[in-house]
């Protein structure tokens, strides 16, 4: 169904990292424009990205209102220059997205090691608590604020002079590991949400090594 000069969007895909959420679709428009609508399962449709020639729409502002909700989006196709035109069923062509639950599905962004400090044979490694676009009481929440104890970090560490990796895990953003005196170590961290079934792990952080700028040494 539909008008002769519009085609329905297809391959509707959610791209979301740390709750920054964009809906993408195909095809690149030829003589047509798109409008996106988003809704929770029980809510009203809200229109976004009106009559755009883009094939993506940033829906972050909508999904951060409640990251635990399940959202559905749909993309409407209109003839360029004649957006009042409708399909044969009396409405414009549209295609539904898959359902999307931000809390369960947003990708975990690559974490960053904020600092490490050596005191004797212990090293305290701190992971940066990245700010998200989720708000509460007019302030932006951090990843830890949103996920709480659902979020853990895994630390990979190894002597600069060898390749054998050790691991530690934490329910906070801090590690305190034992090291051999006089040895330099390298570190990388990964964010993990063990309770998830999809998108459980982030990519590894950039490697940071002792003897470089981020660290501090104290006897």
């Amino acid at each position: 169904s539909g008008t002769t000069n519009t085609v329905a969007a297809y391959n509707l895909t959610w791209k979301s990292t740390n709750f920054k959420t964009i809906l993408e679709w195909e095809p690149k428009p030829v003589n047509q424009v798109y409008t996106v609508q988003i809704s929770t399962k029980s809510g009203d449709w809200k229109s976004k990205c009106f009559y755009t020639t883009d094939t993506e729409c940033d829906l972050t502002d909508e999904i951060v209102k409640d990251v635990n909700q399940t959202y559905l989006a749909r993309v409407f196709s209109y003839p360029a220059g004649n957006v009042e035109s409708t399909g044969s069923a009396g409405e414009p062509l549209y295609e539904n997205s898959p359902e999307f639950t931000p809390y369960l599905e947003t990708n975990l962004g690559q974490p960053t090691i904020q600092s490490f400090e050596q005191v004797g044979t212990k090293v305290n490694v701190t992971v940066e608590d990245e700010r998200t676009l989720v708000r509460r009481n007019n302030t932006f929440l951090s990843l830890r604020d949103v996920f709480g104890k659902d979020l853990i970090y895994t630390l990979y560490y190894w002597k600069s002079s060898s390749s054998g990796k050790k691991t530690a895990k934490t329910n906070t953003n801090e590690f305190l590991i034992d090291v051999d005196k006089g040895e330099n170590y390298c570190f990388s961290v990964q964010a993990v949400i063990p309770s998830r079934t999809v998108n459980r792990k982030s990519t590894d952080s950039p490697v940071e090594c002792m003897g470089q700028e981020k660290g501090e040494f104290r006897e």
Partner: antibody, heavy 125, light 108 residues
Framework: QVQLQESGPGLVKPSQTLSLTCTVS?????????WSWIRQHPGKGLEWIGE???????RYNPSLKSRVTISVDTSKNQFSLKLSSVTAADTAVYYC??????????????????WGKGTTVTVSS | EIVLTQSPGTLSLSPGERATLSCRAS???????LAWYQQKPGQAPRLLIY???SRATGIPDRFSGSGSGTDFTLTISRLEPEDFAVYYC?????????FGGGTKVEIK
Amino acid sequence: QVQLQESGPGLVKPSQTLSLTCTVSGGSISSGQYWSWIRQHPGKGLEWIGEIYYSGSTRYNPSLKSRVTISVDTSKNQFSLKLSSVTAADTAVYYCARDTPYYYDGGYYYYMDVWGKGTTVTVSS
Amino acid sequence: EIVLTQSPGTLSLSPGERATLSCRASQSVSSSYLAWYQQKPGQAPRLLIYGASSRATGIPDRFSGSGSGTDFTLTISRLEPEDFAVYYCQQVGVVPYTFGGGTKVEIK
């Protein structure tokens, strides 16, 4: 030293909502701990109800999730429990507790190290 | 949910004796998430052991914890009069957090 004190009605009618508040003294509710509710039926074991972080992030026991709301009021240094549609099976001693991170094996993990004294709630008409 | 089964239900011992309490999990629990609590009548539980084997602040060294996977043990090397109470294991790794049914240590 952090202390917790539960407060709320000791008697609730069936089908009504049980409301309890836990007041935190001697420390800030926003200091990186989690705050939990646990209950103990008469002569029985302990049942975890749920927890909240100062940011409002919550986790609930799935068996109670449809009836439970835990909220936090950082300005009053309090957190609260609401349990709706109560029955006699909800008669119990209700405890609030602090979940604080303890070092173990390279990382930090949360345990309930400070508890309130508990308050008895009876559900009866 | 992870079910924790404690045994025995009751342990009748005399002061000075050794108490061995068992906690078995229905599925593997990381040691990082296993705790033991002591509860006396009319009181709230008190954290004794965290991380399966680390003593909480102020807990005497006669209390020790061990184990991994699905089998954990709390040992009281020499029972003092104040140790007669109910002991609970707890896992805090998987929601819902669960407690064992408890072991009552009573005076023989």
